[in-house]
């Protein structure tokens, strides 16, 4: 039985140009996380493997950086990063659990950042 | 188009290092991807060996983690594999290749090691 | 170690037909599946990833599907320059692993 939640930053906003970190963190299972995939509507941005560390999409190299921790920071953000995000946590032995978190770009510098998730 | 290729010797003595070079044209190894080494035996068995990332990364086989190294230079576009303490069970052919993902879209031509005295 | 097992291990097919090779997996790896072919005296050439992904050129009579432990390719009206070898090989976790090998040959 999946037992676990994922808590995310929820609904985030920043400003064109700057930058935010992506955060998901997975409670309440002792199941072992053995990948995190980072997925922007269809595309696969980054992927942390337990057991063969981090790859980036090639396509968002310049842009993608990986963590802190399982989390992702996103670089000269643009109006077109304005979306849904997902954290995809595969486990063992529960499966899969996904989180959203969407994000909008602002070209205002008045842009409220959301609070930034820590991983405890 | 990018490419791959491997050089080094044919015949390796016993105990001795193997050591390979992959070559990589028209794309820059440090430009995204992660550069792997893969063998083939004579049995038809494909072995995964390890691989450097474009950050310089380097994550091995554990069956090959005591005698394996795998390194670069960025400025010839080049990657390295290095294997000690070869035997008989080391001849094989060996492959680089670009990997996306952990598997494989780009492989060399492949160059034949012997290993014996 | 991640365990690959691919049937059959040889197979003979005419032109024209339709013939189905499997990768069974000793753990679930989702969908973190490719399969490559390799041509006599060449290099592997990958055809599929992330089970069901074809890869850039080629052509659409190749098939990917399954799911977590069990994995299949399908070529559909075999062609001549279809006949080889064929491995399937996780992307999940180290060691990155490949099948056997099934040899698919001209009757």
């Known amino acids: 039985m999946m037992t676990g939640t994922i808590e995310t930053t929820g609904n985030i906003s920043a400003e064109k140009g700057g930058s935010i970190i992506l955060q998901c963190h997975l409670s309440s299972t002792t199941a072992q996380v053995t990948q995190v995939n980072w997925e922007q509507q269809d595309q696969l941005l980054a992927i942390c493997n337990a057991d063969l560390g981090w790859h980036i999409s090639p396509s968002f190299k310049d842009r993608v950086a990986p963590g802190p921790g399982l989390g992702l920071t996103l670089q000269s953000l643009t109006v077109n990063d304005t979306g849904e995000y997902f954290c995809i946590y595969h486990t063992y032995p529960d499966g899969t659990y996904t989180g959203r978190i969407f994000l909008e770009v602002l070209e205002s510098s008045v842009a409220e950042h959301g609070a930034r998730f820590q991983i405890p | 188009d990018v490419q791959l290729q491997e050089s080094g010797p044919g015949l390796v003595k016993p105990s001795q290092s193997l050591s390979l070079t992959c070559t990589v044209t028209g794309y820059s190894i440090t430009s995204g991807y992660d550069w792997h080494w893969i063998r083939h035996f004579p049995g038809n068995i494909l072995e995964w060996m390890g691989y450097?990332?474009?950050?310089?990364?380097?994550i091995y086989s554990p069956s090959l983690k005591s005698r394996i190294s795998i390194t670069h230079d960025t400025s010839k576009n080049h990657f390295f594999l290095k294997l000690n303490s070869v035997t008989s069970e080391d001849t094989a052919t060996y492959y680089c290749?670009?990997?996306?993902?952990?598997?494989?879209?780009?492989w060399g031509a492949g160059t034949t090691v012997t290993v014996s005295s | 170690d991640i365990q690959m097992t691919q049937s059959p291990a040889s197979l003979s097919a005419s032109v024209g037909e339709t013939v189905t090779i499997t990768c069974r997996v000793s753990?679930?790896?989702?969908?973190?599946l490719a399969w490559y072919q390799q041509k006599q005296g060449k290099s592997p050439q990958l055809l599929v990833y992330n089970t069901k992904t074809l890869a850039e050129g080629v052509p659409s009579r190749f098939s990917g599907s399954g799911s977590g432990t069990q994995f299949s390719l399908k070529i559909n009206s075999l062609q001549p320059e279809d006949f080889g070898s064929y491995y399937c090989?996780?992307?999940?976790?180290?060691?990155?692993?490949f099948g056997a090998g099934t040899k698919l040959e001209l009757k």
């Open positions: 450097i990332s474009d950050s310089g990364n380097t």
């Open positions: 753990e679930n790896i989702y969908s973190y």
């Open positions: 090989q996780h992307h999940y976790g180290n060691p990155l692993t």
């Open positions: 290749a670009r990997g996306s993902f952990w598997y494989f879209d780009v």
